[in-house]
């Protein structure tokens, strides 16, 4: 029961985590910036992995997608890749884990197969979570180091002058969503791996038994002994009836005239 609960909880936690990773990847608020030096109105700038947006105090919002793939910083491309890999692995992990759930019966699937699938999905969730955490952390590091800031404050460009306005970009909501989602996916994956250990069928331990009759009048009754499964109450192969049968441990070393086995 505990194994099923652990597996089910791991699945749900991972599901929430992957949904969060997808949400974070799609969100525009990866970095945010408040402008107080704007001569017109309060303007709020924010950017995501795919587009940049500006929102005014009047409520007007305009977003534009990043214009080129080749011109984007390698770090941004790396973050995109990490998040997408995380989503893909997580999605595959979810698909595998659905079939691995103990509460779901599909054909005559062995417990060992379910255990393997649970372990596979667990590992996928762990890697997925790590990808998301890594991606978000790389982006956060980009913001902290202000890598885009040019040393020259003003320079002449084509068709006029360009002036870099000193600004500070802060962590957007998507970073926190990504960190939490990555963490949940990671925890879910660990839970699946733990559940896998409980799902793996234990080897049935059959002890060798020799039967001894105390007299010719005593007949062997089939089913008198039970093989140990590790779960029954008869775990020590105790005698169920006193018909002279003994386990190998209890066999006397001296011979008996009544021995026929």
């Amino acid at each position: 029961m505990a194994v099923t609960a652990c597996q089910g909880l791991g699945f749900v936690v991972s599901l929430i985590g992957i949904a969060g990773i997808i949400a974070a990847t799609c969100m525009d608020q990866w970095s945010t910036q408040d402008l107080y030096n704007n001569p017109v109105t309060a303007v709020f700038n924010y950017q995501g992995l795919w587009r940049s947006c500006v929102r005014e105090s009047s409520g007007f919002t305009e977003c534009r997608g990043y214009f080129t793939l080749l011109g984007l910083p390698a770090m941004l491309q790396a973050v995109r890749a990490l998040m997408i890999v995380g989503i893909v692995l997580g999605a595959i992990g979810l698909l595998v884990s659905i079939f691995a759930l103990k509460c779901i019966r599909i054909g005559s699937m062995e417990d060992s197969a379910k255990a393997n699938m649970t372990l596979t999905s667990g590992i996928m969730f762990i890697v997925s979570g790590l990808c998301a955490i890594a991606g978000v952390s790389v982006f956060a590091n980009m913001l902290v180091t202000n890598f885009w800031m040019s040393t020259a404050n003003m320079y002449t460009g084509m068709g006029g002058m360009v002036q870099t306005v000193q600004t500070r970009y802060t962590f957007g909501a998507a970073l926190f969503v990504g960190w939490v989602a990555g963490g949940l996916t990671l925890i879910g994956g660990v839970m699946m791996c733990i559940a896998c250990r409980g799902l793996a069928p234990e080897e049935t331990n059959y002890k060798a038994v020799s039967y001894h009759a105390s007299g010719h009048s005593v007949a062997y009754k089939p089913g008198g002994f039970k093989a140990s499964t590790g779960f029954g109450s008869n775990t020590k192969n105790k005698k169920i009836y006193d018909g002279g049968a003994r386990t190998e441990d209890e066999v006397q070393s001296y011979p008996s005239k009544h021995d026929y086995v």
Partner: nanobody
Framework: QVQLVESGGGLVQPGGSLRLSCAAS????????MGWYRQAPGKERELVAI???????TYAPSLKGRFTISGDNAKDTVYLQMNSLQPEDTAVYYC???????????????WGQGTQVTVSS
């Protein structure tokens, strides 16, 4: 690279009108605002008018409603309609776009090369 192309300047008589336009082209992301500044000979560059993408405007108090700024978001173009021009309006007019590139390049002010407006009889 962003380029600003200004047009519409020239010589006009006092009381006349002119319409300046400034079109931005290139890899433009989030435009915070578009505006016009002017610099008269021997003076500091001063604000004329600014418009945001949402249509919020700010004007220099000295203009007394003679100038009107407008923008075309689809064309990334800003216009300045100047009416009742006076000799003191003679200056080089610069258009300005404040563009936010975020993680790709920070916040930048782009300036046109300027267009000469001369008000003289």
């Amino acid at each position: 690279q962003v380029q600003l192309v200004e047009s519409g300047g020239g010589l006009v008589q006092p009381g006349g009108s002119l319409r300046l336009s400034c079109a931005a082209s290139g890899n433009i992301l989030s435009i915070n605002y578009m505006g016009w500044y002017r610099q008269a000979p021997g003076k500091e560059r001063e604000l004329v008018a600014i418009i945001t993408r949402g249509g919020s405007t700010t004007y220099a108090p000295s203009l007394k409603g003679r100038f009107t700024i407008s923008g075309d978001n689809a064309k990334d173009t800003v216009y300045l309609q100047m009416n009742s021009l006076q000799p003191e309006d003679t200056a080089v007019y610069y258009c300005n776009f404040r563009i936010n590139f975020g993680i790709l390049g920070g916040l930048r002010d782009y300036w046109g090369q300027g267009t000469q407006v001369t008000v003289s009889s």
